[in-house]
């Protein structure tokens, strides 16, 4: 498992650590939980062959992931710091639901999924630190999410596989691309 | 004009160390993530370090980790490596860079560093 | 770590002529390529990044696509002061990791 941001998973700066930087904790938060998805990819894909399957876009049309385009300015092309920033809070906000779809998804990794997802709700707190003059930002339904939950939860076991998959996949190219936004800040 | 000026690249001998530094100008240093990049000759280049803004986060190429160590300096608009323990193939020619996004908009000409005994 | 595959090595062309560079990634890293000129005795210099956008101050002759594991960069039609070596380089993620390079020659 990966080691908690905080420890010692990263190069440091000086050996006498002053106490973490905002930028700094998310950064090592991101990593963290961009290791925890690895681990729990790569026990979806030694259990099926979702990861080379080709029948991806089919459940795709089920879900609908957050994903980064031009327009939230997250992007090297049109960047835009506070347009970026709530595109990553509100992503992450909603991708809060799939992450507890994913928790009883896993059997060797129960532990991994549970700490990607702790560690994603922490991630969400320190960048609302980060964004406290925005306003724009708005949190899911929680009844929508309900209702969410317990259609993907009633899916077939292939198309349970392939969502979990897919949000695996989703979650980690989101955060990749906040991570880039966010070097930026 | 933005600018990178490298300085520091010397003859050394197997074990030694060398400082390098790189000077900035033309931009607003303290807003951008700096790198050190690498090439021997007929190579390609290779990414040794990068330090964030603030200098709070570093990332090291597993090559150079526990050997090199970057740091910089805002106020001096200062990017420095120091390299301990050099190789012989440690010897390049060594850029500084400005990284945005993952990439690198803007290198210096570049200091030779030679590792012969 | 990502690697970077390059292809050709080397080619050789004529002025005016239309020419492709191939570059492929050991992972898919969706468009996150920047691609490099360089001279003899010069530094790279950034011609693309996100894998199509072109960097300011460059050629509309320039122009990359691709996506996923599989990127190109094009040179509409080359002008003697495009022979150079040419590099592909991931922006995904780090360790941040270069292609060997395509040298372009003269024909």
């Known amino acids: 498992a990966p080691v908690p941001p905080g420890e010692d998973s990263k190069d440091v700066a000086a050996p006498h650590r002053q106490p973490l930087t905002s930028s700094e904790r998310i950064d090592k938060q991101i990593r963290y939980i961009l290791d925890g998805i690895s681990a729990l990819r790569k026990e979806t894909c030694n259990k099926s062959n979702m990861c080379e399957s080709s029948k991806e876009a089919l459940a795709e049309n089920n879900l609908n992931l957050p994903k980064m385009a031009e327009k939230d300015g997250c992007f090297q092309s049109g960047f835009n710091e506070e347009t970026c920033l709530v595109k990553i809070i509100t992503g992450l906000l909603e991708f809060e639901v799939y992450l507890e779809y994913l928790q009883n998804r896993f059997e060797s990794s129960e532990e991994q999924a549970r700490a990607v997802q702790m560690s994603t709700k922490v991630l969400i707190q320190f960048l609302q630190k980060k964004a406290k003059n925005l306003d724009a930002i708005t949190t899911p339904d929680p009844t929508t999410n309900a209702s969410l939950l317990t259609k993907l939860q009633a899916q077939n076991q292939w198309l349970q596989d392939m969502t979990t998959h897919l949000i695996l996949r989703s979650f980690k190219e989101f955060l990749q691309s906040s991570l880039r936004a966010l070097r930026q800040m | 004009q933005v600018n990178l000026r490298e300085s520091g690249g010397d003859l050394v001998k197997p074990g030694g160390s060398l400082r390098l530094s790189c000077a900035a100008s033309?931009?607003?240093?303290?807003?951008?993530?700096m790198a050190w990049i690498r090439q021997a000759p007929g190579k390609g280049p290779e990414w040794l370090s990068t330090?964030?803004?603030?200098?709070?986060?570093?990332d090291y190429a597993d090559s150079v980790r526990g050997r090199f160590s970057i740091s910089r300096d805002n106020a001096q608009k200062s990017l420095y490596l120091q390299m301990t323990s050099l190789r012989p193939d440690d010897s390049a020619i060594y850029y500084c860079?400005?990284?945005?996004?993952?990439?690198?908009?803007?290198w210096g000409r570049g200091t030779m560093v030679t590792v012969s005994s | 770590d990502i690697v970077m595959t390059q292809s050709p090595s080397s080619v050789s062309a004529s002025v005016g002529d239309r020419v492709t560079i191939f570059c492929r990634a050991s992972q898919d890293i969706r468009n996150w390529v920047a691609w490099y000129q360089q001279k003899p005795g010069e530094a790279p210099k950034l011609l693309i990044y996100d894998g199509s956008s072109l960097q300011s101050g460059v050629p509309s002759r320039f122009s990359g696509s691709g996506s996923g594991t599989e990127f190109t960069l094009t040179i509409s039609s080359l002008q003697p002061e495009d022979f150079a070596t040419y590099y592909c380089?991931?922006?995904?993620?780090?360790?941040?990791?270069f292609g060997q390079g395509t040298r372009l020659e003269i024909k």
């Open positions: 380089q991931q922006s995904d993620s780090t360790p941040i990791t």
């Open positions: 033309g931009f607003t240093f303290r807003k951008y993530y």
């Open positions: 860079a400005r990284e945005y996004f993952f990439s690198f908009d803007v």
């Open positions: 330090i964030s803004n603030s200098g709070d986060i570093i």
